[in-house]
């Protein structure tokens, strides 16, 4: 794809997205704000105590499609949501847990007494 | 073809503000972010910062954050950097350029000149 | 900041020979994306810097064949294959890779 006045477009997006960064802010981020050629994500997961936490940050054009799809992970509670519309647009995403399914109680096998 | 048009100089005196405007023709003025870069003789070149014309988002440099503010006119496609509280330190050629992941095009520079 | 320095601050050569010019940077200029932010300039007196190489090693579209950039990490290169006389000017390395964006200070290409 050409861009203005350019021989090669030099990624799809023709300038450099920033994004807010909270627990994912690359060494090349400054206050909190990172760059990329592709999106800006929240996403929100359990840790290994099922306490909720939230990331924030750039996720670069490579691979993203797939990183932003947010394809369920099996005993995993996780949700993302990802942006492009203006810089900083992941302050604006909300994502929310799935909801704990039947079996995401049970840890193992079941013992009766 | 992309052009950045400055005025070639402007003259004001010691305390006194002024605004730099760069009108932008030859391309899609929201697509591209708008760089402000200063150049002193024998001082070379400084990155003032930058504003993204599509939601006026600005990133300065620090230097720079208490002399420059920059903002956009998306409706003619101009850029302007206002500078306050001038002293002969800032007397330089300021440049526009546009910015993708890089500085493609340049301005030809406006030259300020602070004095009494 | 990363500081660009550059080497060396004037290159005197001979019309048809090869130029080299040296850039270093403080930190390294890979970005979280994988791209490597950095870009070499030309400033003829009295005009504005007009690019010559971006993301180290990319000819802007009209540049001649005979500039080439390598490098990678820190340390980069421009090279020109047989200088010609509008070859002559100010050359400037730029990093976009880290906030502020820095510049080398800059090496004069003159006639020997």
């Known amino acids: 794809k050409k861009e203005d006045g350019e021989s090669t477009a030099p990624t799809a997006r023709p300038k450099v997205l920033r994004c807010k960064c909270h627990h994912h802010c690359p060494e090349d981020s400054v206050n909190n704000i990172c760059s990329t050629d592709g999106y800006c994500f929240t996403m929100i997961e359990e840790d290994d105590s099922g306490t909720p936490v939230v990331t924030s940050g750039c996720l670069g054009l490579e691979g993203s499609d797939f990183q932003c799809r947010d394809t369920p992970i099996p005993h995993q509670r996780r949700s993302i949501e990802c942006c492009t519309e203006r810089n900083e647009c992941n302050k604006d995403l909300h994502p929310t847990l799935p909801p704990l399914k039947d079996r995401d109680f049970v840890d193992g096998p079941i013992h009766h007494k | 073809q992309v052009q950045l048009q400055q005025p070639g100089a402007e003259l004001v005196k010691p305390g006194a503000s002024v605004k730099l405007s760069c009108k932008a023709s030859?391309?899609?003025?929201?697509?591209?972010?708008m760089q402000w870069v200063k150049q002193r003789p024998g001082q070379g070149l400084e990155w003032i910062g930058e504003?993204?014309?599509?939601?006026?988002?600005?990133l300065y440099n620090q230097k720079f954050k208490d002399k420059a503010t920059l903002t956009v006119d998306t409706s003619s496609s101009t850029a302007y950097m206002q500078l306050s509280s001038l002293t002969s330190e800032d007397s330089a050629v300021y440049y526009c350029?546009?910015?993708?992941?890089?500085?493609?095009?340049w301005g030809q520079g406006t030259t300020l000149t602070v004095s009494s | 900041d990363a500081v660009m320095t550059q080497s060396p601050l004037s290159l005197p050569v001979s019309l048809g020979d090869q130029a080299s010019i040296s850039c270093r940077s403080s930190?390294?200029?890979?970005?979280?994306?994988?791209?490597?932010?950095l870009h070499w300039y030309l400033q003829k007196p009295g005009q504005s810097p007009k690019l010559l190489i971006y993301k180290v090693s990319n000819r802007f579209s009209g540049v001649p064949d005979r500039f080439s950039g390598s490098g990678s990490g820190t340390d980069f290169t421009l090279k020109i294959s047989r200088v010609e006389a509008e070859d002559l000017g100010v050359y400037f390395c730029s990093q976009t890779t880290h906030v502020p964006f820095t510049f080398g200070s800059g090496t004069k290409l003159e006639i020997k």
């Open positions: 350029a546009r910015f993708g992941y890089y500085v493609d095009y």
């Open positions: 504003i993204d014309p599509s939601d006026r988002y600005t």
């Open positions: 030859g391309y899609t003025f929201t697509n591209y972010w």
């Open positions: 930190q390294s200029l890979v970005h979280s994306t994988g791209n490597t932010y």
